[in-house]
């Protein structure tokens, strides 16, 4: 989701934005700070064992509107928040995992729990 009532259409900013990065630091980052023409983000998602993992970093302007919209993805628990209002603004973002929605699928007499599959979109 966008913070601070930003419009959904991304517009070119006149200056570079610095963001905190964790688990998502590009090669051109320094001291866990990355640079972008787009947004800072913080994301929480489940890893393959169901443990919540927090990731933060930079999103380039190109495609960031889609990334930050946080459209629910079937079978994937994750949430992302984006910001641009100041450097390292993503230090103050604390997204939470959406509520667990376990669906039981009936296949004959046996009940199968549907497993979550995890896809990374960066």
């Amino acid at each position: 989701k966008k913070e601070d009532g930003e419009s959904t259409a991304p517009t070119a900013r006149p200056k570079v934005l610095r963001c905190k990065c964790h688990h998502h630091c590009p090669e051109d980052s320094v001291n866990n700070i990355c640079s972008t023409d787009g947004y800072c983000f913080t994301m929480i998602e489940e890893d393959d064992s169901g443990t919540p993992v927090v990731t933060s970093g930079c999103l380039g302007l190109e495609g960031s509107d889609f990334q930050c919209r946080d459209t629910p993805i079937p079978h994937q628990r994750r949430s992302i928040e984006c910001c641009t209002e100041r450097n390292e603004c993503n230090k103050d973002l604390h997204p939470t995992l959406p509520p667990l929605k376990d669906r039981d699928f009936v296949d004959g007499p046996i009940h199968h729990k549907h497993h979550h599959h995890h896809h990374h979109h960066h």
Epitope: P26, G38, G60
Partner: antibody, heavy 116, light 112 residues
Framework: QVQLQQPGAEVVRPGASLKLSCKAS????????MQWIKQRPGQGLEWIGE????????MYNQKFKGKATLTVDTSSSTAYMQLSSLTSEDSAVYFC?????????WGQGTTLTVSS | DVVMTQTPLSLPVSLGDQASISCRSS???????????LHWYLQKPGQSPNLLIY???NRFSGVPDRFSGSGSGTDFTLKISRVEAEDLGVYFC?????????FGSGTKLEIK
């Protein structure tokens, strides 16, 4: 038009500190970073660091940490660089420069002479 | 730190000639956003540098079209198609992809 005004020259004694100024006009001061760059004859250009006037966020070249401190006064659209414990190695021309994703405008530079 | 190597150090030309300056970086200047932050400046004696080309090939406002920039990754070139007297001075390449930002050592364009 964009202008960055710097004093022409400063002379100080070794061991002293000095605060260089850079007054910006012709644009919204908080919309761009301000960088500081050092030039010594025959030694090219060296990036000292930068400050974002919108939130006072700074980035430094490791080489100049402890030597340079960057600040701004948004009410007067002025950027400052404090240089401490000056030696002859600090004698140089110091430029302030406006930065978005690249430097597009430079001040005229302040020539600093450190001499006893 | 990224080392920017400029060649030649000195470039004697006749007015009207084409001039070409090379700039090589010690690592790729392609930023994680996909942009390449390689720029060219001209510094005339006693003056501050002036921006000519930004992001490899974009001419800054007011810069004549005889100036052009090209290249990618680690290898970049500035070309002046027909050198005029006002073009004389020291040309610097600069990168703002990696902190600390760094500059080439300069190429002095002078009359042959």
């Amino acid at each position: 038009q964009v202008q960055l005004q710097q004093p022409g020259a400063e002379v100080v004694r070794p061991g002293a500190s000095l605060k260089l100024s850079c007054k910006a006009s012709g644009y919204t001061f908080t919309s761009y970073w301000m960088q500081w760059i050092k030039q010594r004859p025959g030694q090219g250009l060296e990036w000292i660091g930068e400050i974002d006037p919108s939130d006072n966020y700074t980035m430094y070249n490791q080489k100049f940490k402890g030597k340079a401190t960057l600040t701004v006064d948004t009410s007067s659209s002025t950027a400052y660089m404090q240089l401490s414990s000056l030696t002859s190695e600090d004698s140089a021309v110091y430029f302030c420069a406006r930065f978005g994703f690249y430097v597009d405008y430079w001040g005229q530079g302040t020539t600093l002479t450190v001499s006893s | 730190d990224v080392v920017m190597t400029q060649t030649p150090l000195s470039l004697p030309v006749s007015l009207g000639d084409q001039a070409s300056i090379s700039c090589r970086s010690s690592q790729s200047l392609v930023h994680s956003t996909g942009n390449t932050y390689l720029h060219w400046y001209l510094q005339k004696p006693g003056q501050s540098p002036n921006l000519l080309i930004y992001k490899v090939s974009n001419r800054f406002s007011g810069v004549p079209d005889r100036f052009s920039g090209s290249g990618s990754g680690t290898d970049f070139t500035l070309k002046i198609s027909r050198v005029e007297a006002e073009d004389l001075g020291v040309y610097f390449c600069s990168q703002s992809t990696h902190v600390p930002f760094t500059f080439g050592s300069g190429t002095k364009l002078e009359i042959k």
